[in-house]
Amino acid sequence: IPVIEPSVPELVVKPGATVTLRCVGNGSVEWDGPPSPHWTLYSDGSSSILSTNNATFQNTGTYRCTEPGDPLGGSAAIHLYVKDPARPWNVLAQEVVVFEDQDALLPCLLTDPVLEAGVSLVRVRGRPLMRHTNYSFSPWHGFTIHRAKFIQSQDYQCSALMGGRKVMSISIRLKVQKVIPGPPALTLVPAELVRIRGEAAQIVCSASSVDVNFDVFLQHNNTKLAIPQQSDFHNNRYQKVLTLNLDQVDFQHAGNYSCVASNVQGKHSTSMFFRVVESAYLNLSSEQNLIQEVTVGEGLNLKVMVEAYPGLQGFNWTYLGPFSDHQPEPKLANATTKDTYRHTFTLSLPRLKPSEAGRYSFLARNPGGWRALTFELTLRYPPEVSVIWTFINGSGTLLCAASGYPQPNVTWLQCSGHTDRCDEAQVLQVWDDPYPEVLSQEPFHKVTVQSLLTVETLEHNQTYECRAHNSVGSGSWAFIPISAGAHTHPPDEFLFTP
């Protein structure tokens, strides 16, 4: 650690005195302190001399000697008082700038330690300090306002009692800056804008911050716009607003608009897109296939996306048949707005019934006209099967009718014994009918097919089964020839006797 001569913590001299402060260290040493007049520095290897032959009150202060090469950063200090009867204060700063909740040191240094008992801090023109101002005093450093608040940004003076009267220092302006958490908060409205050529438009860019020192501007396609700024202060925040008003928009006004705000903490920006169109538009689309197939009893949501400007004047869902004149219940129709110009309309069809298959149309209207988007809904059914014994052209024939959607495939099985359903062990013969005859195939209805199995003679201890299947499920019908006649066995518990 460097050593200072004279080896006293404080030195009191009179104005005009010669002061010599010598610092000696192991390596080179440096003097530091408040930049002030009349000092001369002389360095000679491991010592440095700070001297003046005409000390003034302005030389009052703490002088520190350091050894730059010392890794421990040791230093020594001496405080010099130049006690001027006419100047009790040496003010080291015209202005002190701190952040809120920091301690603010007002650096009025007492030039005579004897005066310490009679010091006080006041605001300029003798005004008292604001309530709750918590401060302390050090003759070496000055007055410290603890945990300074923004409201304490004032002009202060230090007061000392000299011969029964108060002597004031020059004033010190305290600037307490609000702690800025980050760049200003921004809003740019609207988030998106569409106008028809010739219409009016407004874009508002606003920024706010706890500190007044910030800039905000609006730019169009990277060109800064010259717009007058409105300023305001409310909710303890400074607000700056830029409003772009366009009476009659044209295509050159279209494009990207960015609202940009910056302060010492950085920059924030947000953007929007302005579209200028020739005329009103209305576009309907769906992410779904317009041809829908759903199993009977299940539910379906039909969704339509609408892009429109100007806004919709009307919209509705309509059932176009073919089964009944029922219309979708309004409570099942749902509208959600994604943003100003895009909406989603949903029709919920829970637990679909056979009569609800058909065409559903969404219609929408705006000043640009009306548009419709139609879905075709076909219901899927598992096959229903029935078998009868008949003679065709004199030949005994088993006739199997299967009805379902999609179109069922038909397989005939012959098995031993009398059974409701042939199992693998009993099967004697299997016939696939690749091309059953289609009896009916109307849109939105089941498809009915017919398959014929010509049997020369019915074996009485055997069962003939017609099986039909499609993507939804399968159905079957067992036919049991008996001496009194033929018996047929429908699936499950049903028994049919012709």
Epitope: D32, H38, W39, E95, V97
Partner: antibody, heavy 117, light 110 residues
């Protein structure tokens, strides 16, 4: 070795505020005085003002009404704001460390600030 | 208009001794110490002399400073081509409560 680096916009519009920041590296900002100096093209140097790490500031009287300096010891940086700028404020701006007798031992490389619309 | 007065230019040939003067008043040079800075083209000023005649480490002893009354001077002996630069004097000014500078002297090595 102490190093100083200025940052801030190189172009400022008339009547707006010039803002510069000086970041100190290779040493602590604490317990030293830090100054701003400027130099118009082809001209001499002009001291703008100084700030101590406690927030004490002294400004050149000719600029005092327009200058604000601040310091952030946690980030080892100090800042200059010069308001209501005109073309006469176009200059290379330097930040530097000021010592006891008013000399500057460390300087930044300087940043040119042009005031123009 | 600078507070301290310097000649705008000076010149010399390699090996020569050149002196640059700086004139002030009682509120600056008369009562305070003088500092000198060298500014090479396109660079920041560099401290050359502080407190009238003190050289920071790394500055050759060819550079020396002196002060008398309200004037100061910088002497460069054994002039070298790399000494071609602008030189500025500076001193604390009591009325400014800060440093003032001279207008600078452009030194040309012929």
């Amino acid at each position: 070795q102490v190093q100083l680096q200025e940052s801030g916009p190189g172009l400022v519009k008339p009547s707006e505020t010039l803002s510069l920041t000086c970041t100190v590296s290779g040493g602590s900002i604490n317990s030293y005085y830090w100054s701003w100096i400027r130099q118009p093209a082809g001209k001499g140097l002009e001291w703008i003002g100084r700030i101590y790490t406690s927030g004490n500031t002294n400004y050149n009287p000719s600029l005092k009404s327009r200058v604000t300096m601040s310091v952030d010891t946690s980030k080892n940086l100090f800042s200059l704001k010069l308001s209501s700028v005109t073309a006469a404020d176009t200059a290379v701006y330097y930040c530097a460390r000021e010592r006891l007798t008013g000399y500057f031992d460390y300087w930044a490389q300087g940043t040119l600030v042009t005031v123009s619309s | 208009q600078s507070v301290l007065t310097q000649p705008p230019s000076a010149s010399g040939t390699p090996g020569q001794r050149v002196t640059i003067s700086c004139s002030g008043s009682s509120s600056n040079i008369g009562s305070n110490t003088v500092n000198w800075y060298q500014q090479l083209p396109g660079t920041a000023p560099k401290l050359l002399i502080y407190s009238n005649n003190q050289r920071p480490s790394g500055v050759p002893d060819r550079f020396s400073g002196s002060k008398s009354g309200t004037s100061a001077s910088l002497a460069i002996s054994g002039l070298q081509s790399e000494d071609e630069a602008d030189y500025y004097c500076a001193a604390w000014d009591d009325s400014l409560n800060g440093p003032v500078f001279g207008g600078g002297t452009k030194l040309t090595v012929l």
